[in-house]
Interface confidence: medium
């Protein structure tokens, strides 16, 4: 229903609490480089503006736009030009092209350091001393660095960070209570931010239709009870949800998602048998939890999909008659009997379903053109089976490092002219597959592995998008979104590239080198084994390893000589020889 | 036991309109997607609308997009088919179904009522 005052209907839904916490996510993800002090002041004005519209629904700019009146507060910010160059000529513009173009000026990359936790007594101290504050610079910090982090779901991230501080602040040993727990939360957040610009990805290239076949498919595997008609109204209300969070309109994405929440606490009996646990937790709680609901038990007597997709007389004319409705009915129906296969893998069978029935029911005789389907989806099948026990048994042997290593060394020679710190972050991160999928149970598996690969590919096809290098790269983000993953797989030593020269000081280390943590310690290594790749792209796996344990075997030395810096000094370039001549 | 009954068809001219009913028992009918079929004579069963247990969404075959619309009034166990600028092909007898877990699969339906568009 139409409401005088927009953002008064948001606040009162919302609360202030909510309300001021999904603001600043707003501001910080449009303009990246503002210090939390300058948000937090705009912040206070919109709240304060909100709560007179509250008050008053008919007071002067209480009927303008959200987009309008946060719009408005980004460009009266000063210096807006000097701190933002061009994103500034969007404050030229009129609603909504305005908020299209803040929109295309979001970085997925900022030149921001890395988001550094403080010791544990400092964060305690400031978390006690005000833990709205501290909770707003974490919002800010967070949401500046992921300019698409689902809004509502970094609001459950505060509250799980403000939890743990509550609790570990209070202990004795507060360092060993908050650092397995942190880094718990913020594993699981930068999972989350990867696997939500993905979603953005897919509404922004490919339209809300793309979306909503993700949407059915991943909710048929989840509630393979519900009805095709059920699992579309989720669909659909998941779709505008997710599409205004893409679209910067927070307040309406939060609402609309807590709404949703509701209908399918309310609705249970058509849904799902697995939904109590989490519809008796309060709001974000419940909203995160029903987000990753184990799957409701599969209905035992199921026929089998031929009988309605491939048997029956009528498939031609029930395609013809309504082919959306058609073809939805087949991935929801292939879905719900599958919880064991990817999303992307059940997208690709229906597109090769849509494909086959496109070209056979033109043709004299369909049934016995389109009779095979099934079993030529058969190959599409093994594929990422294939993919998954390979990486799967490469993990086992080589451990998380040396599983990244391996990848690291794979895809700089598919794409070698990509940037080493990018190549190392997809490496890291590609890696972590094997600590987070290979450990679940056969069935998870596959859905893990590459639903997760997929989101990791979409951040490299994003970053490499800003400066397209490599023409093999190019060619796997061109295409649809499904067919990314096996694409990439695809690749093999890009024969194009001319290996770089080998540089000594790319290879030359400092005792430094010594105190970086363990994590730091890890991406220097494998910064150098990319650039030992770019320089001998065909370097045999046996090759790389003897560099690698004689550089691993270097370090340890001289971190453990008594004169460190004469050490690394002296030992350095001969280290460098011995590399030269074990790659020659 | 479940019953269906459909009421409101009739003989209409090209262009005119209708609004079917439909009387629904011996099921919880708000928990429940329904949708309308029609069987034109000498022909197959084609679906042509359904609608959620909420009211939203609807789906429409392709051939009456923009001119049926189907709604619900879940307080009086009710399904509703308006029908607009009809054509002769719209010719068939019109069936409410209980929807069921596979779209082309109906579970139940009533006795169907005659809609003839003829001028």
């Known amino acids: 229903e139409a409401h005088k005052s927009e953002i008064a209907h948001r606040y009162n839904d919302l609360g202030e609490q909510h309300f001021k916490g999904l603001v600043l996510i707003a501001f910080s993800q449009y303009l990246q480089k503002c210090s939390y002090d300058e948000h937090a002041k705009l912040v206070q004005e919109v709240t304060d503006f909100a709560k007179t519209c509250v008050a008053d629904e008919s007071a002067a700019n209480c009927d303008k736009s959200l987009h309008t009146l946060f719009g408005d507060k980004l460009c009266a910010i000063p210096n807006l030009r000097e701190n933002y160059g061009e994103l500034a000529d969007c404050c030229t513009k009129q609603e909504p092209e305005r908020n299209e173009c803040f929109l295309q000026h979001k970085d997925d990359n900022p030149s921001l350091p890395p988001f550094e936790r403080p010791e544990a007594e400092a964060m305690c101290t400031s978390f006690k001393e005000n833990p709205t504050t501290f909770m707003g610079h974490y919002l800010h910090e967070v949401a500046r660095r992921h300019p698409y982090f689902y809004a509502p779901e970094l609001l459950y991230y505060a509250e799980q960070y403000n939890e743990i501080l509550t609790q570990c602040c209070a202990e004795a040993d507060k360092e060993s209570c908050l650092t397995p727990k942190l880094d718990g939360v913020k594993e699981k957040a930068l999972v989350s931010s990867v696997r939500q610009r993905m979603k953005c990805s897919s509404m922004q290239k490919f339209g809300e239709r793309a979306f909503k076949a993700w949407a059915v498919a991943r909710l048929s595997q989840t509630f393979p009870n519900a009805d095709f008609a059920e699992i579309t109204k989720l669909a659909t209300d998941l779709t505008k949800v997710n599409k205004e969070c893409c679209h910067g309109d927070l307040l309406e994405c939060a609402d609309d998602r807590a709404e949703l929440a509701k209908y399918m606490c309310e609705n249970q009996a058509t849904i799902s048998s697995k939904l109590q646990t989490c519809c008796d937790k309060p709001l974000l709680k419940k909203a995160h939890c029903l987000s990753e609901v184990e799957h409701d038990t599969m209905p035992a007597d199921l026929p089998a999909i031929a009988a309605d997709f491939v048997e029956d007389q009528e498939v031609c004319k029930n395609y013809a008659e309504a082919k959306d409705v058609f073809l939805g009915t087949f991935l929801y129906e292939y879905s719900r009997r599958h919880p064991d296969y990817s999303v992307s893998l059940l997208l690709r069978l229906a597109k090769k379903y849509e494909a086959t029935l496109e070209k056979c029911c033109a043709e004299a005789n369909p049934p016995a053109c389109y009779g095979t389907v099934l079993a030529e989806f058969q190959p599409l099948v093994e594929e990422p089976k294939n993919l998954v026990k390979t990486n799967c048994d490469l993990y086992e042997k080589l451990g998380e490092y040396g599983f990244q290593n391996a990848i690291l060394v794979r895809y700089t020679q598919k794409a070698p002219q990509v940037s080493t710190p990018t190549l190392v972050e997809a490496a890291r991160n590609l890696g972590r597959v094997g600590t987070k999928c290979c450990t679940l149970p056969e069935d998870q598996r596959l859905p893990c592995v590459e639903d997760y690969l997929s989101a990791i590919l979409n951040r490299v096809c994003l970053l490499h998008e800003k400066t397209p290098v490599s023409e093999h790269v190019t060619k796997c983000c061109s295409g649809s979104l499904v067919e990314r993953r096996p694409c990439f797989s695809a690749l093999t030593v890009d024969e194009t590239y001319v290996p770089k020269e080998f540089k000594a000081e790319t290879f030359t280390f400092h005792s430094d080198i010594c105190t970086l943590p363990e994590k730091e310690k890890q991406i220097k290594k494998q910064t150098a084994l990319a650039e030992l790749v770019k320089h001998k792209p065909k370097a045999t796996a046996e090759q790389l390893k003897t560099v690698m344990d004689d550089f691993a075997q270097f370090l340890d030395t001289c971190c453990k000589a008594a004169d460190k810096d004469t050490c690394f000094s002296t030992e350095g370039p001969n280290l460098v020889t011995r590399c030269k001549d074990a790659l020659a | 036991e479940v019953q269906l009954l459909e009421s409101g068809g009739g003989l209409v001219q090209p262009g005119g309109s209708l609004r079917l009913s439909c009387a629904a028992s011996?099921?919880?009918?708000?928990?429940?997607?329904m949708l309308w079929v029609r069987q034109a004579p000498g022909k197959g069963l084609e679906w042509v609308s359904v609608?959620?247990?909420?009211?939203?969404?609807?789906y429409y075959a392709d051939s009456v997009k923009g001119r049926f619309t189907i709604s619900r009034d879940n307080s009086k166990n009710t399904l509703y088919l308006q029908m607009n600028s009809l054509r002769a092909e719209d010719t068939a007898v019109y069936y409410c179904?209980?929807?069921?877990?596979?779209?082309?699969?109906?579970?139940?339906w009533g006795q169907g009522t005659l809609v003839t568009v003829s001028s």
């Open positions: 011996g099921f919880t009918f708000d928990t429940s997607s």
């Open positions: 179904a209980k929807f069921p877990s596979s779209q082309f699969r109906f579970d139940y």
């Open positions: 609608i959620h247990q909420s009211g939203t969404p609807t």
